[in-house]
């Protein structure tokens, strides 16, 4: 059984204000069940930037259809970027369990910074 | 406008139990954590309890075992059951939202707890 | 658990100047660093976070510096609705979230 590896190929991702930046992210094995939930920040005061599950996103939407069986890709688009956004952006794999899902793996972090912008 | 009410305190003999509750508005409540933080009659600031956006809890450990820390999103609520109450304890209770670098951005204007014979 | 102490415990400043406190962690927190000011009777405020960043709506006179264990807030022109109480807190090794005992600004 392969051991799940989080995936998130960008270290720096350089985004405009007012336009769209897009969060990769990948799973390389289907296992364990359960979610997997974007942050920005560590620790106990991380914040919860989507839950496919539930809650109000209403800037983010996913660049795959999460709800295909077989899906791998958990990436997102954060639309209207402001300078509030900057911050290092993670995906973490849950373990599906009773009561609680269990965090199981977490991805290494894009830092999500503003560049310049276009002329 | 953010905003954190927070309601519950009172005057309680030492061993009775209490709970407080914290009302949020003005933001997602369930995307941050949310913490209590006390501070006693002429003293600092006591970091409490606090809570992640995914329900683990953490205490320091002058309240571990008798105070419990626990949300209901759907109400947009924090709250705070407070056991075993000791004279120690007497503060004021302060809710705070925390942003993702651990600080604390927003807080409400307390509810003073007293615990006397 | 990071101890932070700081000093002096009573600043006395005449409106106008410049008033300069600092807080010494137990153990370096790099640049995880915040500051927050307290009026009597009210509600702690974030003033600073990483040691440097000012919070949304802080005025620029407000400025904090240094790294490791070591940390200053100054106030380039103190206001008469700067006299409060300041206290700082770590932000990088949690549980618990510590602070410090708090430097009080008073009129001179």
């Known amino acids: 059984e392969e051991e799940l590896q989080m995936i998130q190929p960008e270290k720096l991702l350089l985004v405009t204000v007012g336009k769209t930046a897009t969060l990769h992210c990948t799973v390389t094995s289907l296992l364990p069940v359960g979610p997997v939930l974007w942050f920005r920040g560590v620790g106990p005061g991380r914040e919860l930037i989507y839950n496919q599950k539930e809650g109000h996103f209403p800037r983010v939407t996913t660049v795959s259809d999460l709800t295909k069986r077989n899906n791998m890709d958990f990436s997102i688009r954060i639309s209207s970027i402001t300078p509030a956004d900057v911050g290092t952006y993670y995906c973490v794999k849950f373990r599906k369990g009773s009561p609680e899902n269990v965090e199981f793996k977490s991805g290494p972090g894009t830092e999500m910074a503003l560049g310049a912008k276009p002329s | 406008d953010v905003q954190l009410v927070e309601s519950g305190g009172g005057l309680v003999r030492p061993g009775e139990s209490l709970r407080l509750s914290c009302a949020a508005s003005?933001?997602?409540?369930?995307?941050?954590?949310v913490t209590w933080v006390r501070q006693a009659p002429g003293e600092g600031l006591e970091w409490v309890s606090l809570?992640?956006?995914?329900?683990?809890?953490y205490y320091a450990d002058s309240v571990k075992g008798r105070f419990t820390i626990s949300r209901d999103n759907s109400k947009s609520t924090l709250y705070l059951q407070m056991n075993g109450l000791r004279a120690e304890d007497t503060a004021v209770y302060y809710c705070?939202?925390?942003?993702?670098?651990?600080?604390?951005?927003?807080w409400g204007l307390g509810t003073l707890v007293t615990v006397s014979s | 658990e990071i101890v932070l102490t700081q000093s002096p415990g009573t600043l006395s400043v005449s409106p106008g100047e410049r008033a300069t406190f600092s807080c010494r962690a137990s153990?370096?927190?790099?640049?995880?660093l915040a500051w927050y000011q307290q009026k009597p009777g009210q509600a702690p405020r974030l003033l600073i976070y990483?040691?440097?960043t000012r919070a949304t709506g802080i005025p620029a006179r407000f400025s904090g510096s240094g790294s490791g264990t070591e940390f200053t807030l100054t106030i380039s022109s103190l206001q008469s609705e700067d006299f409060a109480v300041y206290y700082c807190?770590?932000?990088?090794?949690?549980?618990?979230?510590?602070f410090g005992g708090g430097t009080k600004v008073e009129i001179k």
């Open positions: 807190q770590q932000h990088t090794d949690w549980p618990p979230y510590t």
């Open positions: 003005g933001f997602t409540f369930t995307n941050y954590a």
């Open positions: 153990q370096t927190v790099g640049s995880k």
């Open positions: 990483d040691a440097n």
């Open positions: 809570i992640s956006v995914t329900g683990t809890t």
């Open positions: 705070a939202k925390v942003t993702w670098k651990n600080v604390f951005d927003y």
